[in-house]
């Protein structure tokens, strides 16, 4: 996260009677993993299995429709972001199993843990784009009839990805490997050295742009959409909106621990007891944020079952129905025929 967050046992004691509490012989350190790390490993394993399979399926379903269906473009991009993040999980898993030892080199240290942040920014920016699309469909249906096209959707996605890359750069640049003297171990983490102000700046920017600002704008956006749709009964089902809200809400719920601990750690001294406690929870917070990488396909399937009947259709066709059905604009007011049109609002982080 914001510091070197790896925990191993203490040196312990010298064997010599004249010298207490110095260091243990090299092989006398404990091999037990901490409870937060064990929980993180369980979450990583589940997220990897569900995330890779689920997002691969979503990509497969939406890729064919993405040329002509705008909703498919949104869901395709979200699934790609999630899928990419999931690919880093085996490496992160291996590192935690080895007490956060990082045998994969400096380049991997810079790139792989940054994937989750790229995913976070890409997802939240895509969610914002999708929300803007939802908003325009409801409040500017005529404009949508004239200008809302696949080309514009792809441009919006490209801008979202570009901005996400830009916002990930600071964390990427400050990631380094550190080799500990005893016990011999290589660690991968973020090191700002003496520059505490810069560390705080990065944490604040991440909190504001990746969490607080999107939370505020999406809340306002969906409040207006909900008020409009409920007042006009313009949707096929209020369930659609509930699903959309669930997707957006889950993004913020799963990112909350990571963001809170991150901002706290940036304001604490690395040797302070609170910092050290938060450090122990870092892997768990990261794994919790990673749930975002597999939750979307689950929501799509649950939503699809709800609307299509209990798995009467095959999974791909069920997903296709949910993800690629286009929104219909009628006269001056609009309604969404797709259950989960706006459901694509999620991000993932490492």
């Amino acid at each position: 996260m914001n510091s070197f967050n790896y925990t191993t046992p203490d040196y312990g004691h010298y064997d010599d009677k004249d010298t207490l509490d110095l260091n243990t012989p090299v092989d006398k350190t404990s091999n037990t993993l901490r409870v937060p790390d064990i929980l993180a490993l369980v979450i990583f394993a589940v997220v990897f299995l569900v995330g890779v399979l689920g997002n691969a399926l979503v990509v497969w379903v939406t890729a064919f429709e993405a040329k002509r269906t705008i909703n498919a473009i949104w869901f395709l991009n979200l699934a790609v972001a999630d899928f990419l993040s999931c690919l880093a999980l085996p490496i992160l898993f291996t590192s935690i199993v080895q007490h956060h030892h990082w045998p994969f080199g400096g380049a991997a240290c810079s790139i792989l843990p940054s994937l989750i942040l790229l995913n976070m920014y890409a997802s939240i920016l895509l969610l914002a784009t999708i929300s803007a699309d939802r908003f325009l469909l409801v409040f500017k249906p005529i404009w949508c009839q004239n200008f809302r096209g696949a080309g514009l959707a792809w441009i919006a996605c490209a801008v979202a990805w570009g901005l996400a890359l830009l916002l990930t750069i600071p964390s990427f640049l400050y990631r380094v490997v550190r080799e500990e003297y005893f016990p011999p171990k290589v660690l991968c983490g973020v090191d700002y050295s003496h520059d505490k102000r810069r560390e705080r700046a990065v944490a604040i920017v991440r909190l504001v742009l990746g969490f607080l600002w999107p939370l505020l704008t999406l809340t306002i956006c969906y409040t207006f959409i909900l008020l409009r749709t409920w007042s006009r009964r313009a949707t096929r089902s209020t369930k659609t909106l509930k699903v959309v809200v669930a997707v957006v809400a889950s993004f913020f719920i799963f990112w909350l621990p990571y963001q809170v601990t991150g901002i706290m750690m940036s304001f604490l001294e690395p040797s302070s007891p609170t910092f050290l406690l938060l450090n122990k929870l870092d892997s768990l917070c990261v794994s919790f944020a990673y749930i975002n990488c597999c939750i979307n396909p689950i929501i799509y399937v649950v939503a699809g079952q709800g609307f299509q009947g209990r798995l009467r259709k095959s999974l791909p066709s069920l997903l296709r129905n949910v993800l690629t059905e286009e929104s219909v604009v009628r006269e001056s007011k609009s309604f969404t025929r797709s259950t989960v049109d706006t459901m694509a609002q999620k991000t993932q982080a490492v």
Epitope: S3, D27, E180, L187, H194, S271
Partner: antibody, heavy 116, light 112 residues
């Protein structure tokens, strides 16, 4: 008690090699790193690297890779350091010290003088 | 590499004075075990260095209680409450958190 006894001073020519020893006693030799430290005349201390007798692993300061070679003889609980292609800059006192933590026990040092 | 910056390089004192030596590291010395492996050594002319303080503030066996160490993260201090003649020498701070192990340039404690 822990003791580290180093070999005597060496006078060598530029380009030559030198091998010094460090005899350890008073502790389980294979349980701890054996570290080596260089101190040039009137200067600070520089860590050369360590050798871990238990698994035969060595770790070097990047600066001394190719210059120093660390070995041990477990049967005699003796650590060795060989310095290659000596130059005038290699003239210094070389200490062995028991590692795996703070360097609580040091040898008396081996003075290496490189002179034409 | 972790750079250890020691100040002052020379510290003239009178016997009985308090002496304070500062050491700053270029990056955090907090180890993954949550300990900070910052140590202090003293070296007297013609002798090997001797361990004084280990892990920031722990006195090595036989070290008088007039020696104390403090600090955290990147900033550390060695204090000698009342300097005695036998305390004169060169004091080094060192970190063994990361490879390579590094030492400060040394502070020469001498009489005024």
């Amino acid at each position: 008690q822990v003791q580290l006894q180093q070999s005597g001073p060496e006078l060598v020519k530029p380009g030559d090699s030198v091998k010094m020893s460090c005899k350890a006693s008073g502790y389980t030799f294979t349980d701890y790193y054996m570290d080596w430290v260089k101190q040039s005349h009137g200067k600070s201390l520089e860590w050369i690297g360590y050798f871990y007798p238990n698994n035969g692993g060595a770790k070097y300061n990047q600066k001394f890779k190719g210059k120093a070679a660390l070995t041990v003889d477990k049967s005699s609980t003796t650590a060795y350091m060989e310095l290659h292609s000596l130059t005038f800059e290699d003239s210094a006192v070389y200490y062995c010290t028991r590692g795996s933590g703070p360097f609580a026990y040091w040898g008396q040092g081996t003075l290496v003088t490189v002179s034409a | 590499d972790v750079v250890m910056t020691q100040t002052p390089l020379s510290l003239p004192v009178s016997l009985g004075d308090q002496a304070s030596i500062s050491c700053r590291s270029s990056q955090s010395l907090v180890h993954s075990s949550e300990n900070t492996y910052l140590h202090w050594y003293v070296q007297k002319p013609g002798q090997s260095p001797k361990l004084l303080i280990y892990k920031v503030s722990n006195r090595f066996s036989g070290v008088p209680d007039r020696f104390s160490g403090s600090g955290s993260g990147t900033d550390f201090t060695l204090k000698i409450s009342r300097v005695e003649a036998e305390d004169l020498g060169v004091y080094f701070c060192s970190q063994s958190t990361l490879v390579p192990v590094t030492f400060g340039a040394g502070t020469k404690l001498e009489l005024k």
